[in-house]
């Protein structure tokens, strides 16, 4: 027989020879980090066919690291479901707890003994410090000094000293989240008031209000013979400006001989051919829209309108 087979878990006792005679026996022992559990044989014999009788290293078992208990409020999860050396142990904490220590331990061989690469971690309860205080507002549970996981606080704005209330910008409720960090930034309390939206040759059709505060929504339509340039719906944003800007109502052009206009006073279009003119002075033709450069207010239109001159 030629050289006997080699194995992952056991090694030949003595030096291998190039050739073995029929009937000759070789013995194996478990490699370092493995141990023998009877009764399986750990030897083989060169038989008459010049082949070695079947043998396996199933009798040699890997050394295993000591059993690790689940950490309190967490779990120890052996990779590949085994504690044998060369493998890893993963640690995870239950929701509302966070890991202090190593997330992964390695089962390592020290001499002939398998031991873990470090101390098992612990799972500590997620705690948050009090959330930020905000100007012109407050939050619930302001007297609490330590917050647990998923504890929530809700912000509200103080009464304003003037005629206009403070608006809450952002989410009113935040909660103590993973990593002891609040779920989002604290909201802001400030006066948000948009100007009265003036639309020449049109009018507001919904969202009527005494004043227009944060998130106020207004809709417009144009008079007959005018079409909407811009969005028919605008919202008061946190900067006290209308978003999108207040639309304009522009005069529908008289039909040309070649192609009649496909626009009605209720059609919303966007035009790329016009550029706002600066505020004009002096007499102006009555069909031109009144002049305004105020943000969100009507501006005169060049191009289409001037082509009527």
């Amino acid at each position: 027989c030629e050289e006997p087979p080699t194995f992952e878990a056991m090694e030949l006792i003595g030096k291998p020879k190039p050739y073995y005679e029929i009937g000759e026996r070789v013995d194996y022992k478990c490699k370092k980090g493995y141990f023998y559990i009877p009764p399986l044989a750990t030897h083989t014999i060169c038989d008459r066919n010049h082949t070695w009788l079947p043998v396996s290293d199933d009798a040699c078992y890997r050394e295993t690291c000591p059993y690790i208990r689940d950490p309190l409020n967490g779990q120890a999860v052996p990779a590949n479901g085994t504690y044998e050396f060369g493998y890893q142990m993963h640690f995870i904490c239950n929701e509302g707890y966070y890991l202090i220590g190593e997330e992964i331990l390695y089962c390592e061989l020290k001499g002939s003994v398998a031991i873990w690469s470090g101390k098992p971690p612990i799972c500590e309860k997620v705690l948050c410090t009090p959330p930020p205080k905000i100007k012109n507002g407050k939050h619930t549970f302001s007297e609490v000094e330590v917050f647990e996981y998923l504890d929530a606080v809700t912000y509200s704005c103080d009464p304003a000293p003037g005629p206009d209330p403070f608006s809450l910008i952002g989410e009113s409720t935040i909660y103590c989240g993973d990593n002891s960090v609040w779920s989002r930034a604290a909201p802001e309390c400030k006066v948000v008031k948009c100007r009265f939206p003036v639309v020449e040759n049109g009018k507001q059709i919904s969202g009527f209000g005494k004043k227009f505060y944060y998130k106020a929504t207004v809709m417009f339509e144009c008079d007959k013979g005018f079409y909407l340039d811009g969005s028919d719906t605008i919202v008061c944003d946190s900067n006290s400006t209308w978003d999108p800007p207040v639309p304009k109502c522009l005069k529908v052009l008289p039909p040309s001989s070649t192609k009649p206009p496909a626009l009605s006073h209720s059609v919303s279009t966007s035009s790329t051919t016009k550029s706002p003119a600066s505020s004009a002075s002096g007499p102006r033709p009555t069909y031109k829209p009144p002049v305004s450069n105020y943000p969100g207010y009507p501006k005169p239109e060049e191009g289409i309108l001037d082509s009527l001159d």
């Epitope: 009265f196 639309v199 020449e200 009527f208 105020y294 943000p295 207010y297």
Partner: antibody, heavy 118, light 107 residues
């Protein structure tokens, strides 16, 4: 609190021109939206137009071809330029500070009388 | 332009009376209506904005109501200082327009 004082009124012949001034004291005219309103026994109160803080304007279309509103920030004054005056333009002319961007006329000047007569 | 019609054009009342002035719009103006008071030789003064909101410094005997096309200014108990002319004004649509006025005189 800003005070508005109108001036420039007087007697003018039909077809003539006149420029009314609205001087602001105690505040900057450019910080406010200024409207011009006139009043006559025959026509009552009529809103003429507005100049916004950025210098943009809106007009009552009935007067748009003859009246122009402007502002000179260095003089802290708003103006109403009136051309081609008619006898029916005879009225007391007021400048007024629009209330905080809303069309509520809360702060009026004392008014200046314009008489158009031959 | 949106036309506003006030009624009555004038009325006579005594101190302590309850006085009601009506302003009608030819088309709906939501609540976009203001009321002004004017005394002879003076500029008008804002009394009420947005139909029913009292302007600062205006006595609580003044109140406003209505919506759409019909609006009312009420003086609950007329005082000597209240004898004046009253105007309504709409601002839903340019040009902003005024009513013709209602003169409240001493009976």
């Amino acid at each position: 609190e800003v005070q508005l004082v109108e001036s420039g009124g007087g007697l003018v012949q039909p077809g003539g021109s006149l420029r009314l001034s609205c001087a602001a004291s105690g505040g900057s005219v450019s910080s406010y939206d200024i409207s011009w309103i006139r009043q006559s026994p025959s026509r009552g109160l009529e809103w003429l137009g507005v100049i916004w803080t950025d210098g943009g304007t809106n007009y009552n279309s009935a007067f748009m071809s003859r009246f122009t509103i402007s502002r000179d920030d260095s003089k802290n004054t708003a103006y109403l330029q009136m051309n081609s005056l008619k006898t029916e333009d005879t009225a007391v002319y007021y400048c007024e500070r629009v209330y905080d961007g809303y069309p509520w006329f809360a702060y009026w000047g004392q008014g200046t009388l314009v008489t158009v007569s031959s | 332009a949106i036309q506003l019609t006030q009624s009555p054009s004038s009325l006579s009342a005594s101190v302590g009376d309850r006085v009601t002035i009506t302003c009608r719009a030819l088309q709906g103006i939501s609540n976009y209506l203001n009321w002004y008071q004017q005394k002879p030789g003076k500029a008008p003064k804002l009394l009420i904005y947005y139909t029913s909101s009292l302007h600062s410094g205006v006595p609580s005997r003044f109140s406003g109501s209505g919506s759409g096309t019909e609006f009312t200014l009420t003086i609950s108990s007329l005082q000597p200082d209240d004898f004046a002319t009253y105007y309504c004004q709409q601002y839903i649509k340019l040009p902003w327009t005024f009513g013709q006025g209602t003169k409240v005189e001493i009976k």
